[in-house]
C-alpha cells in the first residue's frame, strides 16, 4: 500500500487535466447524457485537437462506435455541444468524408473509426464521459492498493437495459477508489 494522489476515479483515464470514462455497455444518446450526469460528468465535449486525437484513438483502438456530446437536435444543420457551445469551424475537419449527411434524421454525433459520423440518436452505442480531474492537495491523498487489471468486456451483445444500470452502479461504487495511471 502506498500513499499517492490520483486525479481520476477507478477505471477512468486521465488526459490533460481531465478524466474520461469509456463505457463498456451501450445506450442511446440521451441516456448516455444521463449516465454521465449520474457520475458527476458530462457526455464528452471536445475542446482541442489534442483531446480529439486522444479520444478518436481510444474509440478506434477498441473498434467501437461511441457517442460524444454533440448534436444538431436544437436546429437542423447547426451542431452544438451539450454544454451549449457551438461546433467551431476548425473542428469540421474531423467528420468522415461525406458526413454529416443527416440521412434519416441523423442528429447525434459519434466517433466512427477515423473520424466523426452523424447517426440516429435512438441507437444504442458506447459513450464517453468527461469531468475535471481532482486537484491533489495533501488532504486528498489516499491509501491505494494496487488496482486489479480490468478485464476486456465482451465486444458484442453487451448493451442495453440491466447492463447499463449495473455499469452505472459500478462507476458510482468505485467513485471513492482511485486508479494509478
Amino acid at each position: 500500500t502506498e500513499r499517492l494522489c490520483h486525479p481520476c476515479p477507478w477505471e477512468w483515464t486521465f488526459f490533460q487535466g481531465n478524466c474520461y470514462f469509456m463505457s463498456n455497455s451501450q445506450r442511446n444518446w440521451h441516456d448516455s447524457i444521463t449516465a454521465c450526469k449520474e457520475v458527476g460528468a458530462q457526455l464528452v465535449v471536445i475542446k482541442s485537437a489534442e483531446e480529439q486525437n486522444f479520444l478518436q484513438l481510444q474509440s478506434s483502438r477498441s473498434n467501437r462506435f461511441t457517442w460524444m456530446g454533440l448534436s444538431d437536435l436544437n436546429q437542423e444543420g447547426t451542431w452544438q455541444w451539450v454544454d451549449g457551445s457551438p461546433l467551431l469551424p476548425s473542428f469540421k475537419q474531423y467528420w468522415n468524408r461525406g458526413e454529416p449527411n443527416n440521412v434519416g434524421e441523423e442528429d447525434c454525433a459519434e466517433f466512427s473509426g477515423n473520424g466523426w459520423n452523424d447517426d440516429k440518436c435512438n441507437l444504442a452505442k458506447f459513450w464517453i464521459c468527461k469531468k475535471s480531474a481532482a486537484s491533489c492537495s495533501r488532504d486528498e491523498e489516499q491509501f491505494l492498493s494496487p488496482a486489479p487489471a480490468t478485464p476486456n468486456p465482451p465486444p458484442a451483445g453487451s448493451g442495453g437495459g440491466l447492463n447499463d444500470i449495473f455499469e452505472a452502479q459500478k462507476i458510482e461504487w468505485h467513485e471513492h477508489h482511485h486508479h494509478h495511471h
Epitope: 434519416g104 434524421e105 440516429k120
Partner: antibody, heavy 120, light 112 residues
Framework: QVQLVQSGAEVKKPGASVKVSCKAS????????INWVRQAPGQGLEWMGW????????NYAQKFQGRVTMTRDPSISTAYMELSRLRSDDTAVYYC?????????????WGQGTLVTVSS | DIVMTQSPLSLPGTPGEPASISCRSS???????????LDWYLQKPGQSPQFLIY???NRASGVPDRFSGSGSGTDFTLKISRVEAEDVGVYYC?????????FGQGTKLEIK
C-alpha cells in the same frame, strides 16, 4: 440475457399472407434495428430488410418491395414481418436478427427461426 | 447490389489442421471511416447463424482465438488455425456497407 423469440411454424396457401413475430427481451428494444433474413431449404441467407423499432422507419430489399411490411410494437418489445402474395418459393425459415450499431452493423443476436411453408 | 462470392463452397477439414475461406465483393467494402463492413457468420447444423467476425477482422465475444479475419477492400479471408469438430457448419460472409445487405453463398466445412 438478450433473447429474440419468434412465433411458431406456419403453413400457408399460395396467394395468402403470413405474419411472423419476434419478441425481444434482455435489452432496450428501441436501441437496435431488427433485421429480417430468410433461408430457403438447403439454400443460403437472404436479407429482406430492417426496421428501426424507435421510429418505425424501414428499409426493404428491392426484391420484396410491395410484398413485405415490417412493423413493431415497442410496448411489448415485438417486431413483425408480414409477407403477402405468397408463392411456393417463399417457403423458407425466416429469422429476425438484432443489428448492433456499436460494432458497425453486426447481427449479434438471432431468433430461433420460423419455418413458413407455402403449399397448395 | 453488391455481390459476394465465397470459395470454396465445400471445405473438408482435418482436426488440428488449418482451414481458410475466401470472400470477394463486387465493390470495395472500405468505408470512409477506415473500416471494412464485412462480417462473418457460422451456421451450425440445425441452428440459427451466429457471429464470428465483425468489421473484417475483429473477433466477436466468446469466439475462440483460432478464428481470425483479414483483408480489405474487396478481398477477405476467414482462417481457422486448427480445425475442431465443433467448427462444422456453413460459414457466410456478409457485406453491411450498403443496403441491401448481401451474403456469400456459404462455405460448408465438414470434418474428414
Amino acid at each position: 440475457q438478450v433473447q429474440l423469440v419468434q412465433s411458431g411454424a406456419e403453413v400457408k396457401k399460395p396467394g395468402a399472407s403470413v405474419k411472423v413475430s419476434c419478441k425481444a427481451s434482455g435489452y432496450t428494444f428501441t436501441g437496435y434495428y431488427i433485421n429480417w433474413v430468410r433461408q430457403a431449404p438447403g439454400q443460403g441467407l437472404e436479407w429482406m430488410g430492417w426496421i428501426n423499432p424507435n421510429s418505425g422507419d424501414t428499409n426493404y430489399a428491392q426484391k420484396f418491395q410491395g410484398r413485405v411490411t415490417m412493423t413493431r410494437d415497442p410496448s411489448i418489445s415485438t417486431a413483425y414481418m408480414e409477407l403477402s402474395r405468397l408463392r411456393s418459393d417463399d417457403t423458407a425459415v425466416y429469422y429476425c436478427a438484432r443489428e448492433n450499431s456499436g460494432y458497425g452493423k453486426l447481427f449479434d443476436y438471432w431468433g430461433q427461426g420460423t419455418l413458413v411453408t407455402v403449399s397448395s | 447490389d453488391i455481390v459476394m462470392t465465397q470459395s470454396p463452397l465445400s471445405l473438408p477439414g482435418t482436426p488440428g489442421e488449418p482451414a481458410s475461406i475466401s470472400c470477394r465483393s463486387s465493390q470495395s467494402l472500405l468505408h470512409s471511416n477506415g473500416y471494412n463492413y464485412l462480417d462473418w457468420y457460422l451456421q451450425k447444423p440445425g441452428q440459427s447463424p451466429q457471429f464470428l467476425i465483425y468489421l473484417g477482422s475483429n473477433r466477436a465475444s466468446g469466439v475462440p482465438d483460432r478464428f481470425s479475419g483479414s483483408g480489405s477492400g474487396t478481398d477477405f479471408t476467414l482462417k481457422i488455425s486448427r480445425v475442431e469438430a465443433e467448427d462444422v457448419g456453413v460459414y457466410y460472409c456478409m457485406q453491411a456497407l450498403q443496403t441491401p445487405y448481401t451474403f456469400g453463398q456459404g462455405t460448408k466445412l465438414e470434418i474428414k
